[in-house]
């Protein structure tokens, strides 16, 4: 994912200015690029620290520039390092004096494991001295003075990874500053193989691209791109996506490009020579002009791009007919995306011909992690790669890169992702009012933790002890009313805030629990209170059928009117009566009842009753005879409360007649307080007695009352008020 390029301009140092520029192309490193001396390659080189500066022309580039007067201190090995996800990518290069006695054939040389290798140095100065060759600063070989050839060679018949390193050549009397350097890179695998076991076959890397032994990907030379390095860049451009440009008058002349191993260093396409300042001869193109054009149909050969095929033809030699290849383009990808933390499915959509495949589309996180599509589809014109990040978090914010790499070329599109923290209320909602079936809630949505703005708010609620799912209501105000709640039920509430965008629902905030009011069951129906004895009253009611499963009982409260004596009795709910005992005779009691579950019910109206009397009743009082006619008269009376009077008897007879000739009228309703005697004889005197009966017996009249009827023609006397039995 890191496109790190080191430009060595110029590797052969004279008295001109020379530089090293390290570019992290199309990548946003968290850690800075570093340029340093490569003491691993050369231990005894100059110790001076390097003056590394920011390259003002590029956002992510560092530079070391040596002025001409510093030429003597430049010789040696250097590296450029970029770190991504804690992993370092290091590119190595060398600088040497142009006046050295020997010069290398190439700055670097990449070979496969097992190759037959000749490392060669060209003799520039003739001296009467032995020639010596060192590897990584350690002596390995010498050539006697009279045998030093024009081309000094180190022969490795069967190259192994341990043979890799910086080889230097000089005369024995020379030193580091008169040495020539070349670096041998030995791929860990044999030709065309890659993988930990070197058992995978490399993609055919064209245009002198090199197969990376760890990934199988082609490292393309400067000026080519794509999965197979077949696609030539526009003139004077380089980098994995050809986005970087050589700013010199003659393009990339005098720029030696060093790429991560196993590529090494080469000129940009169209140039050759140790200083990359020589143009390719006609018929040749590519890095170091090593590629030969063999264009079909007399097509033109361009030293930078190779064969320039006519429309309808393609291939390195324009040998294939077919639709012209189109460099992929990333479409419909905004520059900035705001994402809510949690699951994220970014989409990368690309056009091009051939259409990019699943394996050719990747997504690179800011930390350098390369993601591969979890889902992929394509239409006639576009490929769509869908990636899955199971949990994206704020630290993942930054520049992400959608990368498409096909045979037709490579394109990367950086875009900024801002990961937002989902909002969550800091406080539980408050219940500001509640009854038995409703609650008024202040949802307390602010303050909240996380990012706004808040798009919507949800109040979640459920009964605590029921296995019910959370119910929710969308709320717009801070105050919300929940209706249709159950009485005497514990509920829990919490608030969920939602911010804009997919997956914007935050975690529910703290939970508030509350209970609705108990609602009392109605009192028992058909309550009736009657005396049973001198010390007991009987309370009865209709059977109770409660609507809920709750256990219930009937609570009966009885209190004496005369004395401060109260008692509460619990009666099992399946009974329909209770005998109130241990009472006092001839005493009035007030009784009420309610049906209780865990909650108390509503009290009934008061019922009053007297216990039965323990003495004879007193005589009725205020006895009056009125409204007398020739054949009738009205008798009225009052009785005292509390003597369990059950009936009143009126006894009358014509005066002077025998005792046994009396008439008894028994009034069984003791609440009736007057009675009309009928069928009397005109102008006749009657003797009237009235007495009360209770559970003990009858009252004793002290005296009799006299009644004389009128002659037939006279009008009746006035009738007194009160209840009357006719």
């Amino acid at each position: 994912a890191m496109d790190l390029i080191l430009i060595n301009s110029l590797p052969l140092v004279s008295d001109a200015e020379t530089s090293l520029t390290c570019i992290a192309s199309g990548w946003r490193p968290h850690e800075p690029i570093t340029i340093g001396r490569d003491f691993e390659a050369l231990m005894n080189q100059h110790q001076d620290p390097l003056e590394v500066t920011q390259d003002v022309t590029r956002e992510w580039a560092k530079k070391v520039v040596w002025k001409r007067e510093k030429a003597s201190k430049i010789n040696g090995a250097y590296f450029c390092e970029g770190r991504v996800r804690g992993e370092a990518i290091r590119i190595r290069t060398m600088k040497m004096r142009q006046q050295a006695s020997f010069l290398p054939a190439t700055l670097t040389m990449t070979v496969d494991k097992g190759d037959n290798v000749n490392i060669s140095f060209k003799k520039v100065l003739i001296k009467e001295e032995d020639a010596v060759i060192y590897k990584n600063g350690s002596f390995i070989h010498s050539v006697p003075r009279h045998e030093v050839p024009d081309i000094l060679e180190v022969h490795l018949p069967h190259a192994q990874p341990q043979d890799a390193g910086v080889y230097s050549a000089r005369y024995i009397g020379g030193n580091l500053f008169t040495s020539a350097f070349t670096r041998l890179i030995v791929r860990r695998c044999e030709a065309q193989k890659w993988g930990p076991e070197c058992n995978h076959l490399c993609t055919a890397c064209m245009n002198n691209g090199v197969c990376h032994e760890d990934t199988g990907e082609c490292i393309c030379p400067p000026g080519f791109m794509g999965r197979t390095c077949e696609k030539a860049c526009e003139l004077h451009t380089f980098g994995r996506t050809c986005k970087e440009r050589c700013s010199g008058q003659e393009g990339c002349k005098s720029y030696v490009f060093c790429l991560p191993d196993p590529y090494g260093c080469s000129c940009a396409t169209g140039w050759k020579g140790l200083q990359c300042n020589e143009a390719c001869h006609p018929g040749f193109y590519g890095p170091d002009c090593k590629l030969r054009c063999s264009c079909n149909n007399g097509e033109m050969c361009d030293r930078f791009q190779g064969c320039l095929c006519s429309p309808g033809w393609q291939g390195l030699q324009c040998e294939r007919e077919g639709i012209q290849r189109m460099t992929p383009k990333i479409v419909d990808l905004p520059d900035h995306i705001e994402v809510n933390s949690g699951k994220f499915n970014p989409i990368c959509k690309a056009s091009g011909w051939p259409l990019p495949t699943n394996e050719e589309m990747t997504l690179v996180k800011p930390d350098g992690t390369v993601l591969h599509p979890k889902d992929f589809n394509h239409t006639d014109h576009f490929s769509v790669a869908i990636f899955t990040i199971h949990r994206i978090l704020p630290p993942d914010s930054g520049v992400w890169v959608c990368s498409v790499n096909t045979v037709a070329g490579m394109v990367e599109k950086p875009f900024n992702i801002s990961v937002k923290v989902l909002p969550k209320p800091l406080n539980a909602p408050n219940v500001i009012d509640t009854g038995h079936n409703f609650a008024v809630i202040n949802i307390s949505s602010e303050p909240y933790f996380g990012d706004g703005p808040i798009k919507s708010k949800k109040l979640l609620y459920k009964p605590v002890n029921h296995y019910e799912a959370w119910q929710h209501i969308q709320v717009t105000n801070e105050i919300v009313t929940l209706n249709y709640l159950e009485p005497r039920t514990e509920y829990e509430l919490c608030v969920q805030l939602v911010r804009r965008g997919e997956g914007g629902e935050g975690h529910p905030g703290p939970v508030r629990r509350f209970t609705t009011a108990s609602i009392g069951l109605p009192p028992p129906r058909g309550l009736n209170l009657l005396p049973k004895s001198q010390t007991t009253l009987n309370l009865t009611w209709q059977p109770i059928f409660p609507s809920s499963e709750d256990d219930f009982y009937v609570e009966v409260e009885r209190r004496s009117v005369q004395k401060s004596d109260q008692q509460n009795i619990k009666v099992p709910g399946n009974l329909t009566s209770v005998l109130l005992n241990n009472l006092h005779p001839r005493e009035q009691y007030v009784v009420r009842a309610r049906v209780n579950t865990k909650a108390q019910g509503e009290w009934s109206e008061d019922l009053t009753a007297w216990t039965l009397s323990d003495i004879l009743p007193p005589q009725p009082e205020n006895i009056k005879i009125s409204n007398i006619t020739h054949s009738s008269a009205v008798i009225s009376w009052t009785i005292l409360d509390g003597y369990s009077i059950s009936s009143i008897t009126i006894r009358y007879k014509v005066q002077g007649k025998n005792e046994d000739q009396h008439v008894d009228v028994k009034i069984k309703n003791a609440t009736i307080t007057q009675y009309q005697l009928k069928g009397l004889e005109p102008e006749t005197a009657y003797q009237v007695d009235i007495f009360a009966e209770n559970n003990i017996g009858s009252s004793n009249p002290a005296f009799s009352h006299e009644l004389v009827t009128l002659p037939e023609s006279q009008a009746p006397a006035d009738l007194g008020g009160g209840k009357m039995l006719l």
Epitope: I432, G435, H436, V464, T481, R513, A517, S518, K598
Partner: antibody, heavy 117, light 109 residues
């Protein structure tokens, strides 16, 4: 700041009536359930009555049911307690209290009601 | 109704001492529906603790509540002179009625 100020206390005879008021300020009175809590001299606290802010639904302690009536006038931010048929055992300081989550987060200073012959 | 019993009736302590007040419910108060109030002579009660253990606004952290079910405790870690008062617990789990404990008086030794 939430403020609750009771008034209307005094000395009455048993069987007589009295009306207490509680003026509220500093919060959205009409939204909150309000309560009366009393404290007899030298005794503990006793919840008396509660009225909902929403629909005026009322609750009473058994000791006052049928004799006391709680009401409110949301337009005046005032809570009332009409006490009829007063008994000697109703003698107490009567506090008006605001409800939050069914506990009492703010209390008035109280008004003394004395019932004696 | 739920009956709350507070103990001891009176607690006689010196400033700086730790006070532990108990409140016992006649039946379980699910999920800590219990509040504590402080009342000084001639003043209205003041909310100290709600939901058994949450301090009300502006209440010093020497006051703490704990407990669940039927047994609850109010602890004052270091008594200050202004802490000598009567303390009441109140349940709001099963209502009406909302019930109070009989109170614990914390007296200065």
């Amino acid at each position: 700041d939430v403020q609750l100020v009771e008034s209307g206390g005094g000395v009455v005879r048993p069987g007589e009536s009295l009306r207490l008021s509680c003026a509220a300020s500093g919060f959205s009175f009409s939204l909150y359930a309000m309560n009366w809590v009393r404290q007899a001299p030298g005794e503990g606290l006793e919840w008396v009555s509660r009225i909902s802010g929403r629909d005026g639904y009322t609750y009473y302690a058994d000791s006052v049911k049928g004799r006391f009536t709680v009401s409110r006038d949301n337009s005046k931010n005032t809570l009332y307690l009409q006490m009829n048929n007063l008994r000697a055992e109703d003698t107490a300081v009567y506090y008006c209290a605001k409800t939050l989550n069914n506990f009492f987060d703010y209390w008035g200073l109280g008004t003394l009601v004395t019932v004696s012959l | 109704e739920i009956v709350l019993t507070q103990s001891p009736g009176t607690l006689i302590l010196s400033p700086g001492e730790r006070a532990t007040l108990s409140c016992r419910a006649s039946q379980s108060i699910s999920n800590t529906y219990l509040a504590w109030y402080q009342q000084k002579p001639g003043q209205a009660p003041r909310l100290l603790i709600y939901d058994a253990s949450n301090r009300a606004a502006d209440i010093p952290d020497r006051f703490s509540g704990s407990g669940s079910g039927t047994d609850f405790t109010l602890t004052i870690t270091r008594l200050e002179p202004e802490d000598f008062a009567v303390y009441y617990c109140q349940q709001y789990y099963d209502w009406p009625p909302l019930t109070f404990g009989g109170g614990t008086k914390v007296e200065i030794k």
